[in-house]
Interface confidence: low
């Protein structure tokens, strides 16, 4: 803690500028009065302080706000922001989208610090939801924070916000997130035409059930072998061979690589060889012919 | 932003052997086929065959499979292609390619080979 | 091989309909030929435009559209404009490789 001393003649603070980079830390804490330093933080940024001169302001800040900094101090933070702790964050009430902004692009480049973790908590939390203006700022600050939400979290996300999120935004997400977000992603997307809505809803798929697989076979989409590697193992296992066939196009050919590996070699196993020799493709384990395909949870009871 | 990178020109002589790189950066690496793409003096395009980053599987157009080799190296998110046996039939512009008409192309290697 | 056949060169007016056409010497083009366009600028500058037949690229303006009209693959730009003076190729998937066409010289005067 800085202490209290009094101003020296002449040195009291008028307003927020450079002179103060030669003030010493006492000097800064007896002569800049902190309401003043509260109307003019957006000077703050373009004054080349040092980390210990913006510890002395940062102190005078929290003197003048115990309760927490209001939203117009906030805005203006800039770097003055990475002096704050999870706890100073928790004290405010952030709404604005301009605010969250400002202090996001604070941290650009760096990982998601634990403030910036508050910050976004606090904020998505005041909203109530993660509504697409909101999820188009963090996704472009942050890509992988769709998928560092838990499913329960991901189902507060309404449907119309999933046109903010990008294939990459998804790179992260495993299967349990997929399969809240698809239906969410099929939902938003219902209106447009095949080939419109195979391209958003591609990176979803990793959450389709086996029925839109099928549908999809039918809309000459040309899903590549990445993509299909992705999808439910138990949404791929019914599809036949000829509706992979339909569903892969060009990249069909790309099974030959895959045939050791899910959902593949799952599948291959559940087709019937004579079927896996119309693709030309040399894929092997197939069910010998002659012989039935029994699944046995469908099976009549002895009477 | 989806961005492929490629190598510089290239001035080599006949009989020797090239490698082209392209850097890939704003998408997943593996999630992609890589295709590459030749552009001869007379500017029309053949297609040289394509890799599949994640299991490197490969399909080559028959015309170029003794001549073109494709490899990638997934650390670094970057394709590769061997050029083999050179003649002055292979100076042209050659182009690395995510998706052809889907997706986006690199901004072209020239290989001239002369003596 | 086979041969993959455009227009050599078309003329069009700023907003007017045009289209550029893509055919096959095996045959009519059908969806399983997976019609691929794509744009080239000068310097060498390359533009996806369309995937399977009628699957616009990502950030590619809606006036661009692909189709199958009759035996051929065709794109169509309505309300052209000066910028989309071009060189356009097309390319057609023939069950294990694909085959591009010799292009279109698109001017719009």
């Known amino acids: 803690e800085v202490e209290k001393t009094a101003c020296p003649s002449g040195k009291k603070a008028r307003e927020i500028d450079e002179s103060l980079i030669f003030y010493k830390k006492w000097e800064l804490e007896a002569c800049v009065d902190a309401a003043l330093l509260a109307t003019q933080m957006d000077r703050v940024n373009a004054i080349p302080f040092t980390y210990e001169q913006l510890d002395v302001l940062k102190h005078k800040l929290d003197e003048l706000y115990p309760q927490g900094y209001p939203e117009s101090v906030i805005q203006h933070l800039g770097y003055l922001f990475l002096k704050m702790s999870p706890e100073d964050i928790r004290k405010w009430n952030v709404t604005s989208l301009e605010t969250l902004k400002a202090l996001l692009e604070v941290n650009k480049g760096h990982e998601m610090s634990p403030q910036v973790a508050t910050l976004i908590d606090r904020f998505v939390k005041g909203r109530g939801q993660l509504d697409k203006d909101t999820l188009d700022t963090l996704t472009a600050f942050y890509p992988g924070y769709l998928c560092s939400l838990s499913p329960e979290e991901l189902s507060s996300v309404p449907p119309s916000s999933i046109w903010a999120v990008r294939p990459q935004d998804l790179d992260t997400c495993d299967p349990r997130q997929l399969d809240v977000l698809y239906p969410k992603a099929r939902l938003a997307f219902q209106n447009m035409n095949g080939s419109e809505y195979f391209v958003k809803i591609q990176s979803f798929l990793g959450g389709a059930p086996t029925e839109d697989l099928k549908a999809l076979s039918q809309q000459n989409v040309s899903m590549d072998l990445a993509t299909f590697m992705k999808l439910r193992t138990d949404a791929v296992l019914p599809l036949t061979v000829a509706e992979v066939q339909k569903l892969l196009g060009p990249h069909v050919e790309g099974l030959k690589a895959e045939e050791r590996h899910r959902p593949v070699r799952d599948w291959i196993l559940r087709q019937r060889q004579d079927d896996l020799d119309t693709l030309g493709l040399g894929l092997q384990g197939g069910i010998p012919n002659g012989y039935l395909v029994l699944d046995l949870s469908m099976q009549e009871a002895l009477s | 932003e989806v961005q492929l990178q490629q190598s510089g020109p290239e001035l080599v002589k006949p009989g020797t052997s090239v490698k082209i790189s392209c850097k890939a950066s704003g998408y997943p690496f593996t999630g992609h086929y890589m295709h590459w793409v030749k552009q001869g003096h007379v500017k029309s395009l053949e297609w040289i065959g394509r890799?599949?980053?994640?299991?490197?599987?490969?399909n080559y157009n028959q015309n170029f499979k003794d001549k073109a080799s494709l490899t990638v190296e997934k650390s670094s998110s970057t394709a590769y292609m061997g050029l083999h046996s050179l003649t002055s039939e292979d100076s042209a512009v050659y182009y690395c390619v995510r998706d052809l008409g889907g997706g986006y192309w690199g901004q072209g290697t020239t290989l001239t080979v002369s003596s | 091989q086979a041969v993959v056949t455009q227009e050599s060169a078309l003329t069009t007016s700023p907003g007017e309909t045009v289209t550029l056409t893509c055919r096959s010497s095996?045959?009519?083009?059908?969806?399983?030929?997976?019609a691929n366009w794509v744009q080239e600028k000068p310097d060498h500058l390359f533009t996806g435009l369309i995937a399977?037949?009628?699957n616009r690229a990502p950030g590619v303006p809606a006036r661009f559209s692909g189709s199958l009209i009759g035996d051929k693959a065709a794109l169509t730009i309505t309300g052209a404009q000066p910028e989309d003076e071009a060189m356009f190729f097309c390319?057609?998937?023939?069950?294990?490789?694909?085959?591009f066409g010799g292009g279109t010289k698109l001017t719009v005067l």
């Open positions: 890799i599949n980053p994640y299991t490197g599987a490969i």
């Open positions: 399977g037949t009628n």
């Open positions: 390319a057609l998937w023939f069950g294990s490789h694909w085959v």
């Open positions: 095996t045959g009519a083009v059908t969806t399983s030929n997976y």
